[in-house]
């Protein structure tokens, strides 16, 4: 806490500029008007203030806006954002995607801090859902963002947002998350033709039920083994040998290399030996 002292003669700040880096903490407190600071926040980042000086500037903004900063100030916080606590951020009402991007940029390349997590949480709650533009932005900064959300949180993702999801965004998702995302993807891509649909839906198939796999088997999709191995075991088990053969197309030969691994192993054990023999792969049920 900085003591209230009168500003020395001639030191009253007329604008936020480089001369302020030579001010002691008490001088910044006494000589910089909070309203001036708020209107010229965009200049703060260009000036090499010390951490202690930034503390004073934050204190001035806190006094001016005890109920939380307005978005016009938040958007230009820059490195001052790193001084904010999650409690500070919970007072904010951030509605602009540009503001979100500006603050994420400050933290770019670093793990998600509690401040950023709170900011994102406030932003998404304010919007009511994780819309496409927001998801696009968040996964650009945090490729694992989607897979760090709970199935309950993912259920608020509208199908239209699924268009923003790239295959790599799903790399770390678990089966429960894919169970939630798959039906949304199916809805989002439903008007695409067969081969284009398969390219888009492929990353989500870890959440697909048996009947959808059966439908895909009728579309000459040639699923690769890596995708097949990520399918739900309970969804694969009811498939017939003919359906798996159609689903995998030329990749069906890869079953031999995976015969000891789930879901292939469990599927093999469910099939009649006569049917397995039609594949000519030497699979033993």
């Amino acid at each position: 806490e900085v003591e209230k002292t009168a500003c020395p003669s001639g030191k009253k700040a007329r604008e936020i500029d480089e001369s302020l880096i030579f001010y002691k903490k008490w001088e910044l407190e006494a000589c910089v008007d909070a309203a001036l600071l708020a209107t010229q926040m965009d200049r703060v980042n260009a000036i090499p203030f010390t951490y202690e000086q930034l503390d004073v500037l934050k204190h001035k903004l806190d006094e001016l806006y005890p109920q939380g900063y307005p978005e016009s100030v938040i958007q230009h916080l820059g490195y001052l954002f790193l001084k904010m606590s999650p409690e500070d951020i919970r007072k904010w009402n951030v509605t602009s995607l540009e503001t979100l991007k500006a603050l994420l940029e400050v933290n770019k390349g670093h793990e998600m801090s509690p401040q950023v997590a709170t900011l994102i949480d406030r932003f998404v709650k304010g919007r009511g859902q994780l819309d496409k533009d927001t998801l696009d932005t968040l996964t650009a900064f945090y490729p694992g963002y989607l897979c760090s959300l709970s199935p309950e949180e993912l259920s608020s993702v509208p199908p239209s947002s699924i268009w923003a999801v790239r295959p790599q965004d799903l790399d770390t998702c678990d089966p429960r998350q894919l169970d939630v995302l798959y039906p949304k993807a199916r809805l989002a891509f439903q008007n695409m033709n067969g081969s284009e649909y398969f390219v888009k839906i492929q990353s989500f198939l870890g959440g697909a039920p048996t009947e959808d796999l059966k439908a895909l088997s009728q579309q000459n999709v040639s699923m690769d083994l890596a995708t097949f191995m990520k399918l739900r075991t309970d969804a694969v088990l009811p498939l017939t040998v003919a359906e798996v053969q159609k689903l995998l197309g030329p990749h069906v030969e890869g079953l031999k290399a995976e015969e000891r691994h789930r879901p292939v192993r469990d599927w093999i054990l469910r099939q009649r030996q006569d049917d397995l023999d039609t594949l000519g792969l030497g699979l033993q049920g």
Epitope: E111, M112, G144, Y145, C147, S148, L149, S150, E152, E153
Partner: nanobody, 116 residues
Framework: QVHLVESGGGSVQAGGSLRLSCAAS????????MRWYRQAPGNEREFVSA???????SYADSVRGRFTISRDSALNTVFLQMSGLKPEDTATYYC??????????WGQGTQVTVSS
């Protein structure tokens, strides 16, 4: 440097209980999605349970109602309470931490053996 260390495994009779721990350093269990996977001999690693950043949880169908995942932010540790254990739960159990950046870290595993 990220380090995950599992402990609490061991041998138990069917119907018994064990509590696995995953102590994390270099990552915060609150800011990461924390998951347990298991791998039985000759099998792929399979998902067991997860605790997401929000604190909500999920489970594989095979363990739901028997296993409970929890975390202690002060200890920076995630737990897996396993009860009603079955022989088919025999496996090496691995702790996984996934960051919003998409980085994934694994522990070295702890062995659980359930005899009938």
């Amino acid at each position: 440097q990220v380090h995950l260390v599992e402990s609490g495994g061991g041998s138990v009779q069917a119907g018994g209980s064990l509590r696995l721990s995953c102590a994390a350093s270099g990552v915060s269990v609150v800011n990461f999605a924390m998951r347990w996977y298991r791998q039985a001999p000759g099998n792929e690693r399979e998902f067991v349970s997860a605790m997401y950043r929000s604190g909500s949880t999920s489970y594989a169908d095979s363990v739901r109602g028997r296993f409970t995942i929890s975390r202690d932010s002060a200890l920076n540790t995630v737990f897996l309470q396993m009860s009603g254990l079955k022989p088919e739960d025999t496996a090496t159990y691995y702790c996984q931490a996934t960051s919003p950046m998409g980085d994934t870290y694994w522990g070295q595993g702890t062995q659980v053996t359930v005899s009938s």
